[in-house]
Interface confidence: medium
């Protein structure tokens, strides 16, 4: 370590020698203190005489009494005023001052860059009384030093409020170059330039940069600090680093990967989560995204059978969450079904085709030809139907459900029957005479009630009328 | 679907040049690179370089700088692989493939090569 | 550059038999970079696996691949006549891309 003492002319000596515990150069025999920061006051015995200083930075005191001397302005020795060492030596400096024991309370405190430094114990304060003042040598060390400790140092010493400051003592650790930017890792498009930053302070500065790409020294003059390196641009993943240079030696940033923004991989694992007669709900795993975010996938559908026209249904959603219900299929279709994704630099291939098939639809037609009939003597109603023209999509037919609504003068009741899928007719008893039944019916499969047929009505009247209702919906052919 | 259409088989003499031609079909042309790779009878693959149709850049394998020049007619979906000074040596079918890049690189779909003998 | 070393370079082997072919690349490739290609006689090569272990579209489940750093394979469960082929792995890492000598695989 170097160091640089600055001795100026004292105007009044302090001491007829040399003080115990003054600036040791070479740094070699110091106190053997913990690393932590603070100060420990000193407090002075009390006086003799009182005394009041005057106010300021150099306290003056009064003349005691006829014949007396005068005693020396306080002030603190001048002391070494610049330390330069390596990190991780020890150090250890001090501020000496002469205090008149007419003054009380003195204590001695650290500071540094405007900080106090409290709470620590590698401060000591010593005194050496004599008749008139006492000698007090405050000591600060620091072991291993850091580039944290570098800064300014003074001492403070209040006396009866005021306050007596010492000359800076400036700790310079030097060391190896210390990043205070490194470059980042980036995605990138293809071909495209950009820009990596990298800075490094000492001491000692200056400190030069150099540049490395895969192992390589990309920059053969080194840059002073900061340095910004364009890259041109690249068509694959590179790593790059930088090497800070100073006169204690080297430091290497961290290496960082430069990606290529590319195209996605395609999702993978697709799976059927809900199948009804008209949708299917999908999830998948997306694949690897290219280094730059999904923006949207792409559901396709082929309806697989051997009479479609083999089209493909294209259904466009946000890339999250990775589910999409698929919507408008044929019921009791089977279908292939893939997915792509896509990013700002295109669209992924298509993850593999799973095959998923749409459950039995409820009957999109409602039967034919409903008639109804009063058959008084048995006393109820007789109706008749034709089997709906259902298409294979909706799955076995599987019976019909009766709507019969009675309605007379304040009343009005529903009754539904089932009747199985062999029946085209059926009959109801009479509810309520002197009321109006409407009828209604509606085929059933496996996939739900299809819709009802136009309703029919017929009067039921008092005993001794007959009443005839003409079909709702006319056979194909007959209308 | 995607394709790619490669020309026909050529017989050249030593010391001559010629250009292969790749036709790209069902797909963005710019978004994937197309490479071309040599093969030579009975013998094993490798990789000439490629070119990248958004911006033309190119990518060559060392061994083939100087033989092979890729070039692009975008507006045509084509591209094409010129061998120059050619020998016996470079007598082989060569491939073209699309590059099916995303920070690692394979060859998802290829042309069914073209047969090049140099021959005098 | 990397070079990848196939083995073995020829192999017979009889239907129904569970075939596996190695790839041992001269320094690391990540499991990611690693992919294979099969080439029927007069045809051009096709995809067959990528990123190590990921079948290609419309690639039969009895192909499979497995391994990483500089070891890697792949594995037919059960060999069909259909799969004579030679089989090529490539590395898709470093420039210029590289491909193995390749796998000469015939029937008994």
């Known amino acids: 370590a170097i160091t640089e003492a600055r001795e100026e002319a004292k105007p009044y000596p302090l001491f007829p020698g040399p003080l115990p515990g003054s600036l040791q150069t070479d740094h070699t025999s110091l106190l053997s203190l913990p690393h932590t920061s603070g100060y420990q006051p000193a407090l002075m015995f009390s006086p003799t005489q009182p005394g009041r200083p005057y106010t300021g930075n150099v306290a003056i005191p009064r003349v005691t009494s006829a014949g007396s001397k005068l005693l020396p302005p306080l002030a603190f020795k001048h002391t070494v005023g610049h330390i330069i060492l390596s990190e991780h030596k020890d150090v250890k400096f001090n501020c000496s001052i002469s205090v008149p024991n007419i003054y009380q309370d003195t204590t001695i405190s650290w500071w540094k860059d405007g900080k106090e430094l409290l709470g620590a114990h590698h401060a000591i304060t010593q005194f050496y009384p004599d008749d008139e003042v006492t000698a007090i040598i405050a000591s600060f060390s620091i072991t291993s030093v850091q580039r944290s400790d570098n800064g300014s140092y003074i001492c403070k010493m209040k006396i009866n409020n005021e306050e007596i400051v010492s000359d800076p003592i400036y700790i310079e650790v030097q060391g190896l170059p210390h990043f205070t930017k490194q470059p980042e890792s980036m995605n990138v498009t293809r071909n495209t330039a950009f820009n990596l930053t990298c800075q490094a302070v000492g001491p000692p500065e200056p400190v030069n940069i150099f540049w490395v790409q895969n192992s390589s020294r990309v920059n053969e003059q080194p840059e002073k600090s900061p340095s910004v390196l364009t890259v041109p641009g690249l068509t694959e993943m590179a790593v790059f680093s930088c090497e800070a240079h100073n006169d204690k030696g080297l430091t290497v940033s961290k290496g960082v990967q430069i990606n290529i923004k590319a195209i996605p991989s395609p999702p993978t694992e697709v799976s059927i989560h809900n199948s009804t007669a008209h949708s299917i709900l999908i999830s998948w795993v997306p694949g690897f995204d290219g280094y730059s975010p999904f923006r949207n996938c792409s559901v396709q559908v082929k309806e697989v059978d051997p009479l479609s026209n083999g089209s493909v249904m294209i259904f466009n959603t946000s890339a999250s969450p990775h589910m999409y219900q698929i919507k408008q299929l044929q019921a009791l279709a089977n279908y292939s079904i893939g997915v792509s994704c896509m990013n700002e630099i295109g669209w992924s291939a298509v993850s593999p085709w799973i095959l998923a098939s749409t459950t039995e639809g409820a009957p999109s037609v409602a039967p034919l030809n409903v008639t109804v009939f009063l058959n008084e003597s048995r006393d109820n109603v007789d109706i008749r139907w034709m089997k709906p023209l259902t298409k294979r999509q909706a799955g076995e037919l599987v019976g019909y459900r009766i709507s019969h609504v009675w309605q007379s003068a304040g009343i009005s009741k529903e009754l539904l029957e089932e009747v199985g899928q062999n029946n085209s007719r059926a009959q109801i008893s009479v509810q309520v005479h002197n009321a109006t039944c409407t009828v209604r019916i509606a085929a059933v499969t496996k996939g739900g009630v299809g819709p009802f047929s136009d309703p029919v009505k017929i009067f039921i009247p008092a005993h001794g009328w007959v009443d005839h209702a003409p079909s709702s919906t006319p056979a194909p052919g007959n209308a | 679907q995607v394709q790619l259409q490669q020309s026909g088989p050529e017989l050249v003499k030593p010391g001559a040049s010629v250009k292969l031609s790749c036709k790209a079909s069902?797909?963005?042309?710019?978004?994937?690179?197309i490479n071309w790779v040599k093969q030579r009878p009975g013998q094993g693959l490798e990789w000439i370089g490629w070119?990248?149709?958004?911006?033309?850049?190119?990518k060559y394998n060392e061994k083939f700088k100087g033989k092979a020049t890729l070039t692009l007619d975008t507006s045509s979906n084509t591209a094409y692989m010129g061998l120059h000074s050619l020998t016996s040596e470079d007598s082989a079918v060569y491939f073209c493939?699309?590059?099916?890049?995303?920070?690692?690189?394979?060859?998802?779909?290829w042309g069914q090569g073209t047969t090049l003998t140099v021959s005098s | 550059e990397i070079v990848l070393t196939q083995s073995p370079t020829t192999m017979a082997a009889s239907p129904g038999e569970k075939i596996t072919i190695t790839c041992s690349a001269s320094?690391?490739?990540?499991?990611?970079?690693l992919h294979w290609y099969q080439q029927k006689p007069g045809f051009s090569p096709k995809l067959l696996i990528y990123?190590?272990?990921n079948l290609a579209s419309g690639v039969p489940a009895r192909f499979s691949g497995s391994g990483s750093g500089t070891s890697y394979s792949l594995t037919i469960g059960t060999m069909e006549a259909e799969d004579v082929a030679t089989y090529y792995c490539?590395?898709?890492?470093?420039?210029?891309?590289?491909f193995g000598a390749g796998t000469k695989l015939e029937l008994k």
């Open positions: 493939a699309r590059g099916y890049y995303d920070n690692l690189y394979y060859f998802d779909y």
């Open positions: 069902g797909y963005s042309f710019t978004t994937y690179d």
């Open positions: 490539q590395q898709g890492r470093i420039v210029p891309l590289t």
């Open positions: 320094s690391s490739v990540s499991s990611n970079y």
């Open positions: 070119i990248y149709p958004r911006d033309g850049s190119t």
């Open positions: 990123r190590t272990s």
